[in-house]
């Protein structure tokens, strides 16, 4: 199988001279590193910082959003060290990490007024942030956390780099004070639980601080990495020396404290994935272990399991795991070894990001009972790393996506079996950011991210599909890189869509090429299910053909059938006329099949013979619509585009199309008749049709009431013509 | 940037008093309070009182309350820590200080910023 590659779809989108100017003022301090990553939530924001300065742009247009240089309390600026989106009361912000000579400043920044209002002096240098919680009270909102943690309002998970873990409370239900990052409130630590919380924070709070809760008292060990599993209610915490620590925040206990297969290397990053429907109550997190720029070159992804007594669906429709049974290392997989065939010795290997993407089956889709817990039908983690390999100028990114459904189903290899490279994996799929790479340098990457939402498989070749469908590989999404000096977005597609671009540029020469367009489209599981066991040479050019048609019409690929025919009717090369005759004739031929399998699947509609339709048949009836749909769109185009042909061609022709297109809407209407629960037509319909579907009455009365009440609204303005 | 300049301790008999000044500049009082702090000979840094942001509230440790008593004048940008009854374990060097990290004992974990400290004894 072949190489995955990005392709750039924009240019470069370079941040204002403003910000670059701000970020480059601090640069040339030794401090000073530029950072820069996309923050997590759904705003479309990106955080930069250099130094004392933040910049915040849109994520996609790289446009400022907002800007603060932070000041601090001497001569020496402070420095952004950490950066988290948090949302509190209708308001964006960010929750920022300050180092100074002297400790370190958690500020609350305002993104719509871009500036700090809230902040707090604390122990060491704080080394991540990340939010529990951004409300507070004794409410059902809250109840999954520590009575003691209920008291407060908004929450904070702060670590430092000897090892100190807090809980600190924002105060979010005091913002009274107009503070910002040199006036910063002090700040209490309590070590124990104290059974007395709202006493004692009333009291704190009375002195101008704020409370907070150790959890870990200074070890001496750097905290690498953090990150609250909302859906387990543990807070993750990596340590410099490779231990990973799970901490419940129901019942502030550490549940999980071991060391990674890496050893004493850092765990830079966590994440979070689900698998669709595991009955033992069985999530999953990942554990980046990276060295990133210092010694050594260490890069490896540890998936732990993590098996749960209960999982439940809170009133908010949230999912909770709880009753923590074991936690143990299932999957490893190093990105620096010879994991993958590279060309010369790598240096230096660093992860860019890693994020987890879910998306949940539409609710008509569901057959669970209405209070049971979802499962995420699609749950990938797409890792992005960097290798720089001595003596070459520009270094290799690669992103690599892991489909949790399909390790399953590959029978949870606990790392990738021998022979067996990223690129031809069935659970993990890696594609090149060359192109990427040549477009941005000499721009260093900051930060990678996938749109969750462009994250799709396409349409499935045929009913079932393929098992090829299934693999990761057949993913398309976009994505958008971070750089020093703006963004770039840039478009990863799977085998299948790659293969029908290839087929799709191929163009008039098809005919040489449809032994390798054959051969492409197999491997990339676009043919039916019965050509997978037939070699390829036991089949005509005429046979492979049609396969490929097939798959061009089943994926919806039209471009692809047009864009032939355009070409063979305005360039007239030698094939021409036979190839366009060749496929008029598959076309229409595929009509007529298309529409007796239609027909053979309605007749349980109108005979009386059943009271409902399955989904399966439902579905073979939208396809055989989808079908009809695509054939008549080439028809149209054979109609439209015809030129120099007979009379009798023409309405031949013209019937044709015709003809297709009233069969179309025959089947659009079925399938509307069939939504509509007037089909299929059962004994006694005659009864239930005694009435009207619409309540013609009531919806008058509706729509006069909205009427009035906009009329009443614009105060005599709205023309409800 | 902040400055904070401490003046006023010397020596004194137990029981008398003593009056403790902070010159701060770089500073809006009505954003943040200011704390005193003490370091007795051979110990760790202890909060002794604060001064909150609104001005008319004041915070005390048990040890010194109702003996201590800090004000401030906005027009001199000062700070003040009036000390009557002062005992034998008043002695030490006094901070003013801004951005504390204390825990529940009132043991001063970490300060952000303080002046270069006055000192106080306390001897017959």
């Known amino acids: 199988m072949r190489d995955l590659r990005a392709q750039v779809t924009s240019g470069l989108l370079p941040f204002p001279e403003v910000t670059l100017q701000a970020l480059g003022e601090d640069e040339i301090t030794l401090e000073s590193v530029l950072r820069g990553k996309f923050a997590a939530g759904k705003n479309g924001l990106a955080c930069l910082a250099c130094g004392p300065q933040l910049e915040v742009v849109n994520s996609i247009t790289g446009e400022r959003l907002s800007a603060y240089r932070f000041s601090g309390v001497n001569e020496q600026p402070p420095v952004v060290l950490a950066v988290k989106e948090f949302s509190w009361q209708k308001r964006t912000g960010l929750l920022i990490g300050l180092e100074e000579t002297e400790g370190s400043v958690l500020c609350l920044y305002d993104l719509g007024i871009s500036k700090v209002v809230k902040a707090v002096v604390l122990p060491g240098r704080v080394t991540a942030i990340e939010p529990i919680i951004n409300h507070g009270g004794a409410s059902a909102s809250t109840q999954h956390l520590h009575p003691s943690l209920r008291w407060l309002f908004g929450v904070a998970a702060v670590v430092t780099d000897v090892g100190q873990i807090l809980l600190v409370d924002l105060c979010l239900d005091d913002l009274s004070c107009n503070q910002n990052e040199v006036e910063a409130s002090d700040l209490e630590v309590l070590t124990g639980i104290p059974a007395e919380v709202p006493h004692i924070r009333e009291s704190v709070m009375r002195q101008g601080r704020h409370l907070c809760f150790q959890l870990v008292s200074p070890t001496g060990t750097a905290v690498s990495t953090l990150s609250y599993i909302s859906r387990t209610n543990q807070l993750a915490v990596g340590f410099s020396d490779g231990y990973l620590a799970l901490w419940n925040m129901k019942s502030m206990k550490r549940e999980y404290y071991i060391q990674l297969e890496s050893g004493q290397v850092p765990v830079y990053a966590v994440t979070f994935q689900e698998p669709e429907n595991d009955p033992r109550n069985c999530c999953y997190l990942w554990a980046v272990q990276s060295t990133q720029d210092s010694e050594g070159d260490v890069l490896s992804l540890h998936l732990l399991q993590l098996a749960f007594g209960n999982r439940k669906c809170l009133a908010s429709g949230q999912i909770l795991y709880e009753g923590l049974e074991y936690c143990e290392e299932r999957y490893t997989l190093d990105l620096t070894g010879g994991m993958f065939p590279l060309r010369g010795q790598t240096s230096n290997t660093k992860l860019l990001g890693c994020q987890s993407i879910e998306k949940f089956r539409s609710h008509g889709d569901r057959e669970e009972g209405v209070n049971e817990a979802l499962s995420p039908d699609t749950s990938v983690s797409v890792f992005t790393w960097q290798v720089n390999i001595y003596g070459q100028g520009k270094p290799s990114v690669y992103l690599g996506l892991f489909d949790i459904n399909r390790w399953y189903h590959a029978q949870m290899p606990d790392s990738l079996r021998s022979g067996e490279y990223l690129h031809n994996c069935s659970y993990f799929a890696l594609w090149s950011l060359e192109s990427v790479v040549s477009r941005t340098s000499p721009h260093g990457i900051l930060d990678i991210l996938v749109h969750e939402r462009s994250l799709n498989r396409g349409v499935p070749p045929s009913y079932p599909p393929p098992e090829q469908f299934f693999n990761p590989s057949t993913y398309n999404f976009d994505a958008t890189c971070l750089l020093n000096s703006g963004v770039v977005h840039l478009t990863c597609t799977g085998f299948q869509k790659e293969t029908l671009t290839f087929l799709k540029k191929s163009g008039p020469s098809l005919n040489e090429l449809i032994p390798d367009g054959y051969n492409r489209c197999l491997v990339a599981g676009l043919l039916s299910p019965r050509f997978v066991d037939v070699q390829p040479s036991s089949l005509s050019q005429e046979e492979q053909l049609e396969a490929i048609l097939s798959a061009a019409i089943q994926t919806s690929s039209l471009g692809l059938l047009t864009g032939y025919i355009r070409r063979w009717i305005t360039e007239e090369q030698p094939n021409s006329a036979t190839n366009l005759r060749f496929v008029l004739e598959w076309t229409w031929n595929k009509v007529v099949l298309t529409k007796e399998e239609f027909d053979r699947l309605c007749v349980p509609l109108f005979d009386g013979s059943c009271h409902f339709m399955d989904p399966q048949t439902i579905q073979s009836i939208q396809q055989c619509y989808l079908l009809l749909s695509n054939l008549n769109i080439v028809l149209s185009c054979f109609a439209s585009e015809a030129r120099e042909i007979t009379e009798r061609g023409l309405i031949d022709l013209s019937n044709k199309f015709v003809v297709s297109h009233l069969i179309c809407q025959y089947a659009q209407v079925v399938l509307w008749f069939s939504h509509s629960g007037l089909l299929p037509e059962g004994i006694d319909d005659s009864v239930q049709l005694s009435r009207l579907c619409y309540n013609y009455p009531v919806i008058q009365n509706y729509y006069t009431s909205r009427r009035q009440k906009f009329e009443r609204l614009s105060r005599g303005k709205w023309n409800p013509d | 940037q902040v400055q904070l300049v401490e003046s006023g301790g010397g020596l004194v008999q137990p029981g008398g008093s003593l009056r403790l000044s902070c010159a701060y500049s770089?500073?809006?009082?009505?954003?943040?309070?200011l704390s005193w702090i003490r370091q007795p000979p051979g110990r760790g840094l202890e909060w002794v009182s604060k001064i909150l942001n609104n001005g008319s509230n004041a915070a005390y440790a048990d040890s010194v309350k109702g003996r201590f008593t800090v004000s401030r004048d906005n027009a001199k940008n000062t700070v003040y820590l009036q000390m009557n009854d002062l005992q034998f374990e008043d002695t030490a060097l006094y901070y003013c200080a801004l951005g504390l990290v204390q825990d529940s004992q009132g043991v001063v974990l970490s300060v952000r910023a303080r002046g270069q400290g006055t000192q106080v004894t306390v001897s017959s």
């Open positions: 770089g500073l809006d009082l009505s954003r943040v309070g």
